[in-house]
Each structure stands twice: as structure tokens, then as C-alpha cells.
């Protein structure tokens, strides 16, 4: 067989589908690898061929499109399962070719089982809702293309094992689930089950997503530096260890990059010669507000180090702030014997 541009196994597209449910899988060639679409390819006389390698096998084999009730079929650039079986798991290849051109890509397909509460090894998308922000909606994902617009499916929403009905602040509205006012108690996994008829058969599509209730932009503030502050003075003798924590609170902000850094005499610690280490820890509140702590440490501080300016800086999409630490050299207490001697007029 002549040379074929082989894009290898596209593990970025780890496709997971539920057992005993319909699945439509588009050939990734047209979405991610080639600069033309299926229609262009088809009208140019190119043919799309599908084959697969079963799980734990090396042998590539053609896909059987002659199964009862057309369980597996191909339509344009889509491979259809109506429905999937557990042993459909494997690596699938779509190859576009004619006598002069060939391009192919493989991708893994995993058919997974779910239990009665929709728990499964499926990786779940996360949808963030703002706390106490007014009506917000989530939509049953990835159901386009399964049935024509003339078909009116029934949609049932669940939270875990339980059908969403009579909830205080959550209302199912067809493909949408409306949260009248999102609260922490609304955190969790939500499942929509879409049921539709096709050729005298009934199919179910199950889609689960995780809802995470996060801080509202209405309540967001610029970073708040809790430490250093004006109430704490870092008073050290030369030779002692200097430890200064910079603790900053960041409101949750969607897609915001939170940054904390120290400057010493206006320079980044990496740009100066003193032996300084910085350790960072991060914690999150239940609404994903963030507290970052960076501890600046100088093992054996010198009197020169104690004269420097140590400033903690913080930045988020809401603004930038800075706070200097109060550092000073401890004045040694007068030695007892000297003081006593002077008191008695000794020379």
C-alpha cells in the first residue's frame, strides 16, 4: 500500500461514551488535522474508510457495518453506534484516501458503564455558577445531531440518584436546568437523561456534569493583603532567621490569574545576591476564593539585610496592591554587669 500521512493516535480526543446508548463520533481529521471539510473531500473524490483495533489487541480490522438493526453505521464523516456495547472499546481509525492521496488518524473510544446513580469513570465537565447571583442555567450538553428537530424528546434531570422535582431553587425546563439562586448546597453532579424515539426504538442519552458554586463577581474585590501589616514588626538580630509571610486573599474571578510576589529593595529576589528562599502555599474556600501565602525566608540575616525594603505585591483581574513589611534590627539590651558598674561610679 502506498504512503499515508499518519497522524498517529490522537490521545487528546479520549472519547468516552456510555454503554447501551447511541454515540455519534466525528472523524477528527476534518476537525483538527486537515484544512478542508468532509463535503470538499467527498466532492474531490476522496473516500472515508473506518477501521478499528479492539482493546488489548494489535490487529487492525474493518468495522462490521452489517450488524442487525444497523447497530454501527457511517453517515458522512460520522461513525454511529445505535447503541454502543461494552466491547466496542478500542482504537478507531478514520482514513481519507483516493489513488493519489491518503491521510489517517486514530483515536481511543472507551465505552463505560454507569450505575443507578449515574456514577461512572466518565470525566465530567465542570460548570461554575455564581453564588446568589440570580437565575442561572445549565444546558444538557452534547446532544446535538442525535435526532431531528421534528422529534420532541423527553428530558429528565437528576441530582445523584434523585429526580429533580420539588426542589426549592432548581427547576427543570426541558434541555435547561435553572438555578433560581445558586447556593453551596447546589454543588454536585447533575444528570440529564434525554429519551427519544427512532425507527420504532427508544434511545436514551445520559449526560452528567459537575456544578460548582463560586464567588459572585458582585462581591469581588481587589486582592487583600492580610500580612504583612502595620501591627507586626519583624525585629531580628544579625545571624537569626528572618521569616516574613505574605498572605493574600483573592476573590474568585472567572479566568483571573492571581499573582503574589516579593520585592527586596525594588528587585525580584532572583535578581539580588542575598540567600533568600520563598515558599508558596495556596488554599481555597468553598466558593473558590483563594488565599495565597508566600513566606520569604533568610536563614542568617545580616544587619545590611535588616535595612532593606521588603514589599509584598499582589495582582488579580480586579487590581494590584502592595504592602511593605516592617523590618528592623533588634537593639541589644545593655549588658547587666556594665550597667551595674556604671551605676556605682566604678571606673
Amino acid at each position: 500500500s502506498e504512503r499515508c500521512d499518519d497522524w498517529g493516535l490522537d490521545t487528546m480526543r479520549q472519547i468516552q461514551v456510555f454503554e447501551d446508548e447511541p454515540a455519534r463520533i466525528k472523524c477528527p481529521l476534518f476537525e483538527h488535522f486537515l484544512k478542508f471539510n468532509y463535503s470538499t473531500a467527498h466532492s474531490a473524490g476522496l473516500t472515508l474508510i473506518w477501521y478499528w483495533t479492539r482493546q488489548d489487541r494489535d490487529l487492525e480490522e474493518p468495522i462490521n457495518f452489517r450488524l442487525p438493526e444497523n447497530r454501527i453505521s457511517k453517515e458522512k464523516d460520522v461513525l454511529w453506534f445505535r447503541p454502543t456495547l461494552l466491547n466496542d472499546t478500542g482504537n478507531y481509525t478514520c482514513m481519507l484516501r483516493n489513488t493519489t492521496y491518503c491521510s489517517k488518524v486514530a483515536f481511543p473510544l472507551e465505552v463505560v458503564q454507569k450505575d443507578s446513580c449515574f456514577n461512572s469513570p466518565m470525566k465530567l465537565p465542570v460548570h461554575k455558577l455564581y453564588i446568589e447571583y440570580g437565575i442561572q442555567r445549565i444546558t444538557c450538553p452534547n446532544v446535538d445531531g442525535y435526532f431531528p428537530s421534528s422529534v420532541k424528546p423527553t428530558i429528565t434531570w437528576y441530582m445523584g440518584c434523585y429526580k429533580i422535582q420539588n426542589f426549592n431553587n432548581v427547576i427543570p425546563e426541558g434541555m435547561n436546568l435553572s438555578f433560581l439562586i445558586a447556593l453551596i448546597s447546589n454543588n454536585g453532579n447533575y444528570t440529564c437523561v434525554v429519551t427519544y424515539p427512532e425507527n420504532g426504538r427508544t434511545f436514551h442519552l445520559t449526560r452528567t456534569l459537575t456544578v460548582k458554586v463560586v464567588g459572585s463577581p458582585k462581591n469581588a474585590v481587589p486582592p487583600v493583603i492580610h500580612s504583612p501589616n502595620d501591627h507586626v514588626v519583624y525585629e531580628k538580630e544579625p545571624g537569626e532567621e528572618l521569616l516574613i509571610p505574605c498572605t493574600v486573599y483573592f476573590s474568585f474571578l472567572m479566568d483571573s490569574r492571581n499573582e503574589v510576589w516579593w520585592t527586596i529593595d525594588g528587585k525580584k529576589p532572583d535578581d539580588i545576591t542575598i540567600d533568600v528562599t520563598i515558599n508558596e502555599s495556596i488554599s481555597h474556600s468553598r466558593t473558590e476564593d483563594e488565599t495565597r501565602t508566600q513566606i520569604l525566608s533568610i536563614k542568617k540575616v545580616t544587619s545590611e539585610d535588616l535595612k532593606r525594603s521588603y514589599v509584598c505585591h499582589a495582582r488579580s483581574a480586579k487590581g494590584e496592591v502592595a504592602k511593605a513589611a516592617k523590618v528592623k534590627q533588634k537593639v541589644p539590651a545593655p549588658r547587666y554587669t556594665v550597667e551595674l558598674a556604671c551605676g556605682f561610679g566604678a571606673t
Epitope: D115, S116, K163, G188, N189
Partner: antibody
């Protein structure tokens, strides 16, 4: 350690109502459901309905629709089951039960209350 | 609603012997089946869920098997504390339903 403590035995007249309480201690922060199940003398177990206290969601078995009301007071971690229009065949031990979360398949009756005997007699 | 049928209604077994209890569903419940033990004057106790997974603290002599419509609870060597009534319950479809119970008594 999560525990469910139910209210004491009741004797009721036919046609009246009974309200049984179920107080949860050591409740987790995550939402959970309280189930109600009854058992007539010498008979099997019969599921009546559930409530999710923190979310307000509830559902009842078809057989009890219109006669049963399940409520909850989140502030006291207490669920209630009220059965109206009582008849002699409602004489039973009424149990509440729960799981740790809303997500554990098959473990929604993990922890049980001690049961409340309701006797309906004229 | 799914009807759960248990057999036998009563099982007479000597201590140390094996007991096999059956539960049949009127339609497939996959592996969404639980078993409970109930002693006189006590609330039921969860033994098995997912047809074969032992609940926390349940001894290894209790085992469950089956899927679809036919299920079995086996007690490999009956102890005196195992004489009780056993119920199966499906949680595949609402409403969740229980079997009528099997009483395991001393022979």
C-alpha cells in the same frame, strides 16, 4: 457517627393524622436524602417516599400520593412524615433511613432509625 | 413498578450449614440490588449492595451474586446471630421496591 432518632409510639383513631419525626445527628455537610419505609405487623418493607432536606426535593410512592406529606426542618436536622386519613391497615412500624450522600448507588438505606409504632384503632 | 419475589418464604437450616436465598425481579434491574437483614424488634441492616458488594462491617460469610432478574444471597456457615428475616430491594427503577422476605430459622 450519623444516627437517626425517631419519635415515640402513637395510637390514633381512624380518619385522623399522625406525624412522625426523625432527627439526624452527626450530619455531613453534603446534601443527603431521608427515606421513609413502613412495615405492617408480620409483613415486608414498603417504601413510602423521601425528602432531601437541604434542597427541598421530595417524592412519594404512588400508593401514598395525596395522603402522605414529608417535610424537613434543616435548622434542627429533623425530617417529618405525616400520614392522613388513617385506617386500621396503616398500623405499622414506620422507619426513616438515609445514606451519606445523594450519589451512592445502593446505599441510600445505609443508616436506619429505631422505628416508630403507629397503631390505628377505634 | 418492579415486583421482587423471594424464595423460599422460610428456610430451616442448622448452625454451621450453608443458606442460599433467592430473589427474582419482574424485569431486569441490572446489578442494582441490595440485601437487608432484620432481627425481631430491630430496624433492617444493609448487608449487600450492587448485588455483590458487602456493606461496611459485614462478615465475609455473607455473599451476593446475580444480575438482571435472578439474585442469590449466600451465608456460607450460619452463626446463631444470622437467624433473621432477609429482604432484597431493587433500586434500578422508581419506586424502589422490596421483596416480601425470607425467614431463616434454626432447624
Amino acid at each position: 457517627q450519623v444516627q437517626l432518632v425517631q419519635s415515640g409510639a402513637e395510637v390514633k383513631k381512624p380518619g385522623s393524622s399522625v406525624k412522625v419525626s426523625c432527627k439526624a445527628s452527626g450530619s455531613p455537610a453534603e446534601p443527603y436524602a431521608i427515606q421513609w419505609v413502613r412495615q405492617a405487623p408480620g409483613q415486608g418493607l414498603e417504601w413510602m417516599g423521601y425528602i432531601i432536606p437541604s434542597l427541598g426535593g421530595y417524592d412519594y410512592a404512588q400508593k401514598f400520593q395525596g395522603r402522605v406529606t414529608i417535610t424537613a426542618d434543616e435548622s434542627t436536622s429533623t425530617a417529618y412524615m405525616e400520614l392522613s386519613s388513617l385506617r386500621s391497615e396503616d398500623t405499622a412500624v414506620y422507619y426513616c433511613a438515609r445514606g451519606q450522600t445523594l450519589y451512592e448507588s445502593g446505599r441510600q438505606f445505609d443508616i436506619w432509625g429505631q422505628g416508630t409504632l403507629v397503631t390505628v384503632s377505634s | 413498578e418492579i415486583v421482587m419475589t423471594q424464595s423460599p418464604a422460610t428456610l430451616s437450616v442448622s448452625p454451621g450449614e450453608r443458606a442460599t436465598l433467592s430473589c427474582r425481579a419482574s424485569q431486569s434491574v441490572s446489578s442494582n440490588l441490595a440485601w437487608y437483614q432484620q432481627k425481631p424488634g430491630q430496624a433492617p441492616r444493609l448487608l449487600i449492595y450492587g448485588a455483590s458488594t458487602r456493606a461496611t462491617g459485614i462478615p465475609a460469610r455473607f455473599s451476593g451474586s446475580g444480575s438482571g432478574t435472578e439474585f442469590t444471597l449466600t451465608i456460607s456457615s450460619l452463626q446463631s446471630e444470622d437467624f433473621a428475616v432477609y429482604y432484597c430491594q431493587q433500586y434500578n427503577n422508581w419506586p424502589w421496591t422490596f421483596g416480601q422476605g425470607t425467614k431463616v430459622e434454626i432447624k
